[in-house]
Structure formats: C-alpha cells, structure tokens
Interface confidence: low
C-alpha cells in the first residue's frame, strides 16, 4: 500500500525483464530497467545502501521516472533479489537473479570470515544455516564437526533452499562446534563459510517479585521492587516493567546477572525498580515481565500508597469472646493501618507477656483457657511513625460445664436403713449457672449385675431406662426441693436436694445438671437395707489422733457371719456418666478387717476400733452380713471422714474503739481449728470475769460490756487455745466522758 497517496492511483513499477527469476552466467553484464509513475529507487543484494562501486544506477534517456541498474562482470555473490520501488511507499517490483558461478556456488556475505548460528535444544525448533546458493538446483549437504557428521535433505525436516539456506532441526547439531554447507558439482566439492554453533537456552523457570505482596507505603517513601528470573543455562533475559505512573521522574531501573554456585544448572537475573518518593499516582499494579525470546514469564504485585501513616481497628474486631474451660482461645487484633502497628495486650490494665500458656502478639492466644482468664483484655495499636494510638477492649467470658462436687467426696455406694428419711444432694458449679438440674431414678434390681454376669467396671449397671422423679410409682416417695444458691470455697454454687420420705426400695438416683456449654451428672447408689446398721462411737467425724469405733448391729435371728471390710481403691477410676459397681457383687476390692463381736438379747454387734485415727484411715467401711435362710449377702457402707488437726486461728480483727460512758460495747471473736479451740478473754492481761455488766455468750465468742464505765477502758485480748497452741487478737477500748456520781443511800 502507498503511504500518503491512495494506492489505486499508482501501478507497480515495470521491469524490463518480466520474470520472477533470472539465471545468468558469471562474468556477463546484468542490466535491468525500471519504469514507473513517480520517483524510483533500486535495492540489490549485499548492499542495501546503494554505495556499491560496481553497481551503476542511471536515469533513462527516454523518459521521466525511469532508472536502469547495470552490473558489469557479475559474480556468484551478486545472486539475490533486485528490487525497484517508489520512494516512501511499499510498492515494489522484485526479480531474483542467480549468477551461476560453478567455482563459487555459495554466496558469501561481504565481511564474514565465518558466521554464527544460534540454536536452542528444543525438539520442535529448526535452525536455518544461511548458506545461500548462486545456483538454484544445487545438491547441498550440511557438515557438522566434531565428530564429523553429514546431513542431507530428506524431503521432510532437512532441506536446502538457494534463497534461504540449509534448514535442520536444531537438536541435531547442538553437539557441534561448527557447521558448513557443501555442494558437489562435477565431482568437485565447494564449501560455504564456516558457521560457529552457539547453543542458547530459552526456559524461564520462574519470575519472583520481592516483596511479593502486601506492599504498603505512605507518600514520599521509597519503593524498591526486585524481580528475579531463574532460567536454564545459556539464556539471555530482557526485563520489561509495567507500572501505574510510567512518566515518573524519580524512577530507576537496574538490571544485572546474579552469580550462581559453580555447577549450578540454573542462571539468575535481577531487575530492580526504585521510585525514590512515591506519590498517590504510584499506587497500582506493578508487573515485571522477563523474556528470553522464545519464552516470557511475568509476575505482578499491588502497591498501595497511603496519604499518610494511620492505624484503625477493622470491623471484625470482637468485643465479646466466649470460651469453655480447656479450649484454646484466639483473639486476633484485626486492624487497618500503615505501617503495621505495634500491638500490646493488657489484662485488667496489666501488660501481658508471652509464655508457655499465653502468646500475646498479632493474635492473643490462650493455650488452655481457665476461669481465671475471664476478664477485660485491652489491645493497644500504636502507629510506629505517627505514634497515634487506638485501643479496643475485648471481654473474655470463660464458661465452665457443670461440675458436681459430691462426686469426689461421697461414697458412691452408701447404704441406707429401711424406713428412714434421707436427703441426697448435688452441689453444682457451672458458668453460667445450670439452667436446670433434673433428678432421675430407676430400681436397683433393674440395673444390678446378675451373679452370672462378669462385672464391668465401665458399665456395671446395664440399664438405660431412667425415670423422672415425678414418676415415683414402684419406688420411694420423693420430693425435690427448690434449688439453693451458696457461696462455697469462694464460688457461687447451685445446690439441689432430693428428699426420700421413706427408704423402702433400693434404687439408683441420678442428678443431671445442664448449662449452655455442657452437662454433668452424678449417680447415687441408694441401697436400702433392713439388715445391718452402722453407727460411729463417739463421733460422726473424729479428728486425727482421736479414737473411734465403728459398730455394725444386725438382728441375730436374721443374720450371721458379720464381717468388717474396708473398700480399697477402685481398680479403675469411675468416669463421668459411669455407674458404681454394687459393693456386695465385687468383693475383690474389699480388705477384711479385725473386729470384736458382742451380743445382747436380740442383736449381734461387730465393733471395729480405730485407736489414734489418722488421715489414712479415711474411706469407705463395709459391714457384710449373710441372711441365715437365703444365704444372700447384705452390705452396708459408711464413709468415714477423719478431720485433720488444725491449730487455732482467729478470723477477723478486733478493732480499737472509742465509746462514751453509759453506752454498750459488743465485739466478736470467731476462732477455728481442730479440735475446736477454747476462747478466753483478758483485760490488761488479766482474765476477764463475767459480772452484771460483762456478758460472754456463744462459747465466749461474743463479749458484751453494758453501760460502760471509765474503768472498763483498757487493752482487751481474745485468745483461742487448743492442744495445738493458741492464737490471740487485741484491741484498745477508750472510754470518753465524765463519770456521774451516784448516791447510794
């Protein structure tokens, strides 16, 4: 197409030789005339500039827009395309001229002593060795060395074209150091120039940007982006960057090769883009493309440019976190900001440091949350540049599934005397408090193991049918009291009690407490016996070093073979939801004890004495009696608790006080200890004696001084003593005012 003029107005230049191909002999003269409709120019082989001395281009004598090209004594190297064209257009006429020079059948380029061919080892690629011919129909082969190999055209992938050269798959000659073309004419061999073979790679393994993501800056900061291309050996790389503000004044690009370890099968190239002071217009996508000619790989990253440093909380930041005891708690500090803020966590105002139980970083992690972790956690974000602070409070509430206190305290196998009224208790600790505590029951015989069955510790009662206590038909008459709330060991607990009006039937009772995070249950074996009865002499709960006797009384006409046992440790612990094994069915866990037998008119009494009871004597004691007729064993279990000896302590302080004459003073002195201590009062180190005005009550715990007089002023001491020592507290009572004189007549 013509440039600047409509193409329809111009015909192609007309050549005097109307052929596509012209073959002439060497040493003859080549002359071609070209006529057209505008200014014309010629181009010919080996000299595109028109400065060749041998070639002559002249204006025709017979007309405008006509030029003749003349080459006297042509040689093989004059072979090629001769083009006549209109200036400044693409309109041209071409003739290809072969100058047959049998002494020099290959066209040599003017300057080359040897050529270079670049190849890749790609199986699908072919390479052209540019050994052009001055004769069109030569018989040409390609020689490669070393070792010497010859390749001949095969009509398929190996071919020779006089205008193009020798074409061959590149991998076939990748071993060679050099190649050349050879033509046979009348048994003479003619060689082209040598071509050095250079194997170039093309594979790019990857292109990596660093930083790869999350790049944030504020206006005026420096951006440095590194683009690394990893390639196979013998690869050259061109880098090309695309970025938002191409006209940037302060942009700098540096490309360099990186050294790799010797023997490495890989090359590395690095391109670094630097913008010294970014502006908002530099925000956007940055793309680095690495090209090896045959392959291009690229990678991109987004650069965010902020107007100025800032910090703010993200809207996913929790204000309330709820967890259950034992869980791992994660509270992430969700923020928006640049640069990333410094993060500091506080609990109830105290800084948190990381340790094996807690990690205080971008995410506050509590490995195994417990009740004491409940509280307010403050996270403070500080922008490291502007020092701007943002704070946020997260309330952590730790929930506790119901735990039933008596499970670990009371024997799971207590026995109860027929006809008695009994109270069963479940003390539940849970956060939040249980939304219900339900009681269930079932008959013992429906659940107890048959003698033939092996006792399974994990499921000793093969029964599932628990009945609501409202349905007490066939069982004991029951009443469930309203739940009470009590502060026990500093914890708010819910106490549920079930009253059995008359113990007539052996049964199992289960209390089940449920709150929002779980459930807890306790199974009570309520074994009713008409048989033996256990009593403790002299006290239900002896203190260590005191003596205690356990009495087992049984009707002599009904029972025989009274024996005392102590229940040993369970062979396996009883897990939540499992039922205790009936004690008479499993004597393996019992230790037989020495005891003394007494009798009266109706009963046998088996007495087991513990002299100087110790804490090791605590546990479950079993009295076993055998029915004289049926030989069935009856067991009664009593849990013995031995109280630890504790030296006296006085809780609370006596306060110094000032009182006016005629008023009253009331003070309290509460002492604890085991055995319980005796309380004594002293005034000015002398024993305080009760009289009409001085009253001691509640085992001397409370002291009242009525209508105080000036002489009641002084140092008062409360002293609590037991065999384990004494404790005392003191206070000074000041009496103000003048003593009234009274007349005694």
């Amino acid at each position: 197409a013509s440039v600047g003029l409509p193409s329809v107005s111009l015909d192609l230049p007309r050549l005097s030789i109307q052929k596509d191909i012209l073959t002439i002999k060497a040493n003859t003269t080549l002359q071609i005339t070209c006529r057209g409709q505008r200014d014309l120019d010629w181009l010919w082989p080996n000299n595109q500039s028109g400065s060749e001395q041998r070639v002559e281009v002249t204006e025709c004598s017979d007309g405008l827009f006509c030029k003749t090209l003349t080459i006297p004594k042509v040689i093989g190297n004059d072979t090629g395309a001769y083009k006549c064209f209109y200036r400044e257009t693409d309109l041209a006429s071409v003739i290809y001229v072969y100058v047959q020079d049998y002494r020099s059948p290959f066209i040599a380029s003017v300057s080359d002593q040897h050529g270079v061919v670049y190849i890749t080892e790609n199986k699908n690629k072919t390479v052209v060795i540019p050994c052009l011919g001055s004769i069109s129909n030569l018989n040409v082969s390609l020689c490669a060395r070393y070792p010497e190999k010859r390749f001949v055209p095969d009509g398929n992938r190996i071919s020779w074209d006089s205008k193009k050269g020798f074409t061959i798959p590149s991998y076939m000659i990748s071993y060679a150091g050099m190649v050349f073309c050879e033509a046979k004419i009348n048994d003479e061999s003619y060689q082209s120039i040598m071509y050095i073979v250079v194997v170039v790679g093309y594979r790019i393994y990857d292109v990596v940007l660093s930083p790869s993501h999350g790049i944030e800056l504020s206006v005026g900061e420096k951006l440095v982006l590194n683009c690394t291309a990893r390639t196979e050996l013998n690869v050259g790389i061109d880098f090309n960057w695309e970025y938002p503000s191409s006209k940037h004044q302060h942009k700098k690009l540096v490309n360099r090769d990186l050294k790799t370890q010797s023997g490495s099968e890989m090359k590395k190239f690095l391109s670094t883009l630097t913008i010294d002071g970014v502006t908002r217009s530099d925000q956007g996508l940055y793309t680095c493309a690495a090209s090896s000619g045959l392959m291009t790989k690229k990678n991109s990253t987004f650069v965010r440019v902020h107007e100025k440093p800032f910090v703010a909380f993200g809207s996913g930041m929790e204000s309330l976190v709820e967890a259950t005891v034992g869980e791992r708690v994660r509270i992430p500090a969700k923020y928006l900001g640049y640069p990333p803020p410094e993060i500091k966590w506080y609990k109830n105002g105290i800084p948190l440091e990381s340790n094996h139980t807690i990690k205080a970083g971008h995410v506050l992690t509590i490995m195994e949350v417990s009740e004491r972790d409940t509280g307010n956690y403050t996270v403070i974000l500080t922008n490291p540049i502007s020092k701007e602070k943002q704070s946020h409070v997260v309330s952590l509430v730790v929930y506790v599934p119901p735990q039933i206190g008596e499970k670990s305290l009371i024997s799971p196998v207590d026995s109860y005397q027929y006809g008695t009224t009994q109270t069963l208790t479940c003390t539940v600790y849970a956060i939040p408090p249980p939304h219900h505590i339900h009681w269930y029951w079932q008959l013992e015989e429906e659940c107890a193991n048959e003698p033939s069955q092996a006792v399974s510790v994990t499921n000793p009662y093969p029964c599932e049918e628990w009945r609501s206590v409202e349905d007490f038909q066939g069982g004991n008459k029951i009443e469930v009291n309203k739940n009470q709330f009590a502060l026990i060991e500093g914890k708010n607990k819910t106490v549920s009690t079930l009253v059995i009006q008359a113990a007539n039937v052996s049964a199992l009772y289960k209390c089940e407490a449920v709150n929002k995070v779980g459930r807890g249950e306790r199974v009570i074996s309520f074994h009713v016996t008409r048989g033996p009865e256990i009593t403790l002499q002299p006290d239900m709960q002896p203190t260590e070093q005191e003596s205690v006797s356990l009495w087992c009384t049984a009707d002599r006409s009904t029972f025989e073979n009274l024996t005392w046992y102590k229940l040993g440790p369970q062979p396996l612990p009883i897990h939540v939801g499992e039922l205790p094994t009936p004690v008479c069915k499993n004597l393996d866990t019992l230790w037989k004890l020495n005891a003394t037998m007494f009798s009266n008119s109706t009963n046998d009494i088996l007495i087991m004495e513990l002299k100087n009871a110790s804490l090791q004597d605590q546990g479950d004691y079993v009295c076993l009696a055998q029915d004289r007729k049926t030989k069935k064993r009856h067991c009664v279990v009593r849990q013995l608790t031995v109280l630890e000896r504790v030296a006296p302590t006085i809780t609370g302080n006596l306060e110094n006080q000032t009182t006016s004459i005629g008023e009253s003073i009331e003070v309290s002195c509460t002492a604890s200890g085991n055995p319980p201590p005796q309380i004594m009062w002293f005034k000015d180190n002398e024993t305080l004696v009760e009289d009409s005005g001085i009253v001691l009550k509640d085992g001397n715990r409370n002291l009242t001084i009525r209508r105080v007089r000036k002489e009641d002023e002084g140092l008062y001491t409360c002293q609590a003593c037991s065999v384990l020592g004494c404790a005392k507290v003191e206070a000074f009572f000041i009496i103000e005012g003048a003593q009234e004189k009274t007349n005694l007549e």
């Epitope: 965010r304 993200g314 996913g316």
Partner: antibody, heavy 119, light 112 residues
Framework: CQSLEESGGDLVKPGTSLTLTCTAS?????????MYWVRQAPGKGLEWIGC???????TYYTSWAKDRFTISKPSSTTVTLQMTSLTAADTATYFC????????????WGPGTLVTVSS | AVVLTQTTSSVSADVGGTVTIKCQAS??????LAWYQQKPGQPPKLLIY???DLASGVPSRFSGSGFGTEFTLTISDLECADAATYHC??????????????FGGGTEVVVK
C-alpha cells in the same frame, strides 16, 4: 460468574417474624468473606443491619438491630436473616452483600428482596 | 459511631459536564470510605474504595478524593447513564459494632 440472591421477602403483619435467605452462586463462602445484610426503605438511603464473619462465625449488628435480628450461616452457600416483632418501619428492600477480607467495602450485592409489613 | 453526611440530596448537570458530590464524616476515618452508584430497582454498585481507588471495570471518568473527614466523588464527561443515586460508606471501626457500616443519605444525580 459469582452472584448472590435474596429470597423470603413477603407481605407480613406487624408483630410477626420472617426469615430471609441469601444464596451464593458460582462460589462458596470462604474464611475471608464477611456477609452483610443492608436494607433500604422506599425512597430512603441504605441502612446497615449486620454481618457474619464466615471465618469465625462471629456476628455483628447495628445497635437498633441487636434484639430483633439474627444472622446465621446454615450452609457454605447460604446466609439467613431472622427478623422478629416486625413493624411498619421494617418495610424495605433487604440486600445481602459480600466483602472479601479487609477492608469492608461491598464488592458483590444481591438484587434485593422486598419485605412489606402492614396490617 | 461514625455519621456520614451527604449535604446535597440532589444535583443536576448537563451531558459532558462535571459533577461533584461531597460526603462528610463526623470523625477522622482516614481513607476508609467507599462510593456506590445505585439505579432505581437495582442494588448498589461499587465505584470507589479507599477514598480514591477505582473499582475494576469502572470508567476513569469517576474519581474519588479526600482523607480524614472530607470526601469528594467527581464524575467528569457526564453521560446519561450516570443518572443515579450515589452513596458514600465508611468502613472505619472504632470499637463498637454499631460503627461498622455507616452510609451517607445518598445524592441523586440528574443528567440534563
């Protein structure tokens, strides 16, 4: 092609309850997503109701929505808005929208579903 | 809680002209602001986020600016198709979930 569609809009009487469902097509919710409910009374502006953090399951509500509106995620492609004690003031087109991670602008919206509360 | 105010409820301009819509925040919200376009019977469509970043597929005729409390949406070379209501939305969060999704009241653009 990723899209959201709300359903469940209806004419209901004051004091009743209604549940709207937002169904995702062409994608499943991922931990990076937050799903939102926004409403628009006829001729009025947009009003943010609340959202659910798909990653943690945490829900967030605007102050007036706390007591009567509940957002939940029954499946990996549905989010619901449960509304109770409806009044005429709740008459609006209800949209569900999605944001991906931070920050919380809404990149995908459903076409909306109309809820009319009238006796 | 952040309150966004779009003082102008309606603005009109000629085809080919330029229109500017303002949005004011009751407190510093940095650049945490988005703009949406809403046509009748359709859901809103995100135009701008981070106060000035163009959402994908949005023509460069739309631009956003501002930081802190004052924000502006500019539409140049106005086309008929730009007739719609434009809403601003803050996604700044200062500690109460009620802050999370404040919207402005909306500004209607009428193209003559």
């Amino acid at each position: 092609c990723q899209s959201l569609e709300e359903s469940g809009g209806d004419l209901v009487k004051p004091g009743t309850s209604l549940t709207l469902t937002c169904t995702a097509s062409g994608f499943s919710f991922s931990a990076r997503h937050f799903m939102y409910w926004v409403r628009q009374a006829p001729g009025k502006g947009l009003e943010w109701i609340g959202c659910i953090d798909i990653g943690s399951g945490s829900t967030y509500y605007t102050s007036w929505a706390k007591d009567r509106f509940t957002i939940s995620k029954p499946s990996s492609t549905t989010v619901t808005l449960q509304m109770t004690s409806l009044t005429a003031a709740d008459t609006a087109t209800y949209f569900c929208a999605r944001s991906s991670g931070y920050p919380y602008y809404f990149t995908l919206w459903g076409p909306g579903t109309l809820v009319t509360v009238s006796s | 809680a952040v309150v966004l105010t779009q003082t102008t409820s309606s603005v009109s301009a000629d085809v080919g002209g330029t229109v500017t819509i303002k949005c004011q925040a009751s407190e510093n919200i940095y650049s945490l602001l988005a703009w949406y376009q809403q046509k009748p019977g359709q859901p809103p469509k995100l135009l701008i986020y981070s106060a000035s970043d163009l959402a994908s597929g949005v023509p460069s005729r739309f631009s956003g600016s501002g930081f802190g409390t004052e924000f502006t949406l500019t539409i140049s070379d106005l086309e008929c198709a730009d007739a719609a209501t434009y809403h601003c939305q803050s996604y700044y969060y200062s500690g109460s979930s009620a802050d999370t999704g404040a919207f402005g009241g909306g500004t209607e653009v009428v193209v003559k």
